[in-house]
Amino acid sequence: IVLRPSRVHNSEENTMRALTLKDILNGTFSYKTFFPNWISGQEYLHQSADNNIVLYNIETGQSYTILSNRTMKSVNASNYGLSPDRQFVYLESDYSKLWRYSYTATYYIYDLSNGEFVRGNELPRPIQYLCWSPVGSKLAYVYQNNIYLKQRPGDPPFQITFNGRENKIFNGIPDWVYEEEMLATKYALWWSPNGKFLAYAEFNDTDIPVIAYSYYGDEQYPRTINIPYPKAGAKNPVVRIFIIDTTYPAYVGPQEVPVPAMIASSDYYFSWLTWVTDERVCLQWLKRVQNVSVLSICDFREDWQTWDCPKTQEHIEESRTGWAGGFFVSTPVFSYDAISYYKIFSDKDGYKHIHYIKDTVENAIQITSGKWEAINIFRVTQDSLFYSSNEFEEYPGRRNIYRISIGSYPPSKKCVTCHLRKERCQYYTASFSDYAKYYALVCYGPGIPISTLHDGRTDQEIKILEENKELENALKNIQLPKEEIKKLEVDEITLWYKMILPPQFDRSKKYPLLIQVYGGPCSQSVRSVFAVNWISYLASKEGMVIALVDGRGTAFQGDKLLYAVYRKLGVYEVEDQITAVRKFIEMGFIDEKRIAIWGWSYGGYVSSLALASGTGLFKCGIAVAPVSSWEYYASVYTERFMGLPTKDDNLEHYKNSTVMARAEYFRNVDYLLIHGTADDNVHFQNSAQIAKALVNAQVDFQAMWYSDQNHGLSGLSTNHLYTHMTHFLKQCFSLSD
């Protein structure tokens, strides 16, 4: 059992109090992390508590204010970006959120050499994306779906694209589906390492069907939001990649990068772009049926001013048991020879590991191996490769940082983090300075998070960047629940679970059980991280036992578990939650008449199917913003796991796996269905169809909609949501208010 957080024993039990819902909604026990904004090997920027932007020099130990809070405040800046030549800073204000990553903003350029804002040729507003070149102070930005370039901030802009059109053609920024399901960024342009070239994607959404929903606002008539959104089987965006010489942009203009022939023969996606040198670029492409990925290395041909992608530099990654990659196809990390690279993909045993590719994928040298998975390659230097994995002590829900010395033979491996703060820290990420001279470690738990600075050569800890002392003190008089992470072995499947137990847990007593589920492909819920959240409150104050279970389809435990759900979503994920509940009942401390399940998004889908499983296990449950039919969800995500909703492909399972098909089975459970009406991601349509099916089946249920709220149900809706769900659960479990 992991007691969290560790603290001095307080004999005066009466000074301890349980968590309240108010604590959670107010974010009273939220933690801070410290990610340095590296600007060189030994310098980083950080926004101080009083909002000054401060430069820290690790070598000298000195700090310098580079931008005062007054300057930030003068334009209401909420973010900043320093040009690599240190001459200018952009200040970002008027932030206006669009989708998950995208937003528009107003940008001001501040000249650090004279302490004044740049006047003349000011940037238009609002801008969709803006970034500095990696060297100097060139600016690339996207305005009204077109890309512009400035050689210096005060110069007039050079317009690179002219065909940009709202909801039709997107240049340098992704459309909805590429943003959410493929790139996971707000941008689709990439500078070459020294800023000579600028690569960008053009997305043509002209033929994509549009999702339309009402935004009620305050006006007499609601607005209609229209988003080109390809649902499963629908027409997809057409993508093209161009590269322009930023030194002489008007000379030959943008040059298109050719698509590999084996990809171009049918519908395809562009998945990522990685610059290798100023004249070599690596593009990754994916067939619409997402089990074949091609990595293509292209070179600039000076004589023709074009980009050449020889077949000999095409590397194919194919999955025969599922889809290519994990959630996404991994990206390469190139070595110093500018042709060979390191990449994570499945080994012959079906575990994702680091491989070194020098000529062909077939001849790849496996760098890591074992019945665990390499998760992320952070940095490759001339003598070291830093990566994270869940190898240590065979807990898939942990993350430790490792260093492999690639300069020596045979390469030696060292766990950098495994024994640093073993009880407190088992889940790390890292942030490296140039050439990995220094790095920051951010530990997320299971104890109170802590961020530390380390020497990249010796791994020695230099200083603590953030240790959340205030949080530690605030928690001293709180009765936190106990947490345990264990596993169940069922029919050759390992089900890892996290159980959150009331503070005075007594194995001889019976407790209501709440299952919190996500369960989406390549997700992981059972992680050794710190959190004081709604379920912490339910355990601490309301005496519930909460369990999270990672079943089939979840990540980082090998392809057998991951790809088990391929082409049959909604079956094994549900089965495994039910199996786990039965095992929990066998443990003897669960009141089997008071078991509930809840989930959000994919979790809402799984919780709905579990409630409608006809097992009689669940008394009640909640689905927040659930998917109800895979025909309603985005093509890129859905087809990755389900194939196409066509007769000759997988239409039958698309139809069999809907929540609506099981409407009758909700008759014997209490069901609370919740959705935001302005959900751009999982459309309100999903819940509308569940509700219609339940009404048609004359099944009683409870529902709550949140007007004009998206998939995140943020702001005041959050408070209302958790208060409402708490009342529902307490009523279901017969707990007094």
């Epitope: 060189s40 090997g41 030994q42 310098e43 101080s48 000054n52 401060v54 430069l55 070598e59 000298t60 130990g61 000195q62 700090s63 310098y64 204010t65 580079i66 005062s68 007054r70 320093l82 690599p84 030549d85 240190r86 650090l112 050499s113 060297v135 140039d434 050439y435």
Partner: antibody, heavy 119, light 111 residues
Framework: QVQLVQSGAEVKKPGASVKVSCKAS????????MDWVRQAPGKSLEWIGD????????IYNQKFKGRVTMTIDKSTSTVYMELSSLRSEDTAVYYC????????????WGQGTTVTVSS | EIVLTQSPATLSLSPGERATLSCRAS??????????INWFQQKPGQPPRLLIY???NRGSGIPARFSGSGSGTDFTLTISSLEPEDFAVYFC?????????FGGGTKVEIK
């Protein structure tokens, strides 16, 4: 406009201490570090150290470690540099200089304070 | 510490001529693509004045005839056409490593 006004000339005996002041105006003191540099007669310049006004954090040239102390009085926008255990070779013009951290450059200088160490 | 050597010690030129001042560092002062070499001008009885920072960036109010270049260990200050007020002592200085150090100076005098 930016001005750094230093205290007047000092004559000190060997072994004594000297405290030179530098009053900043025309900008917000806490926005820039203050460095101190000295110049012996007919010689080049020598960096003494740096102070970060927000926290009072300092870095000193190892050569002066243990003998130099830099402090700040935010209420009067004044920075002080004290040098102890003076010897004849400390005779020099002492300058305070505004240090622009992002460029590691000393962009504005005080008029200088002449310190003479003589028995 | 990093030692900066300036040459020549004295440069005798006439107004209108081009002046090229050299500064050599005992070790590289490159910091990940940036070189923190600064140049100062000093006239008798006055404090130094910042001319060039970060190798090639002109300080506030510095005329365009002053330019800086170089990387690694070798740096140059160029005055394209000497004006009467340019006759002074010029110092290079590195801020790449503590202690920050100055060169011995180059005196530009009227021929």
């Amino acid at each position: 406009q930016v001005q750094l006004v230093q205290s007047g000339a000092e004559v000190k005996k060997p072994g004594a201490s000297v405290k030179v002041s530098c009053k900043a105006s025309g900008y917000t003191l806490t926005d820039y570090n203050m460095d101190w540099v000295r110049q012996a007669p007919g010689k080049s310049l020598e960096w003494i150290g740096d102070i970060y006004p927000n926290t009072g954090g300092t870095i000193y040239n190892q050569k002066f470690k243990g003998r130099v102390t830099m402090t700040i009085d935010k209420s009067t926008s004044t920075v002080y540099m004290e040098l102890s255990s003076l010897r004849s070779e400390d005779t020099a013009v002492y300058y305070c200089t505004r240090f622009r951290g992002i460029h590691y450059a000393m962009d504005y200088w005080g008029q200088g304070t002449t310190v003479t160490v003589s028995s | 510490e990093i030692v900066l050597t300036q040459s020549p010690a004295t440069l005798s030129l006439s107004p209108g001529e081009r002046a090229t001042l050299s500064c050599r560092a005992s070790e590289s002062v490159d910091n990940y693509g940036l070189s923190f070499i600064n140049w100062f001008q000093q006239k008798p009885g006055q404090p130094p004045r910042l001319l060039i920072y970060g190798t090639s960036n002109r300080g506030s109010g510095i005329p365009a005839r002053f330019s800086g270049s170089g990387s690694g260990t070798d740096f140059t200050l160029t005055i394209s056409s000497l004006e009467p007020e340019d006759f002074a002592v010029y110092f290079c200085q590195q801020s790449n490593e503590v202690p920050y150090t100055f060169g011995g100076g180059t005196k530009v005098e009227i021929k």
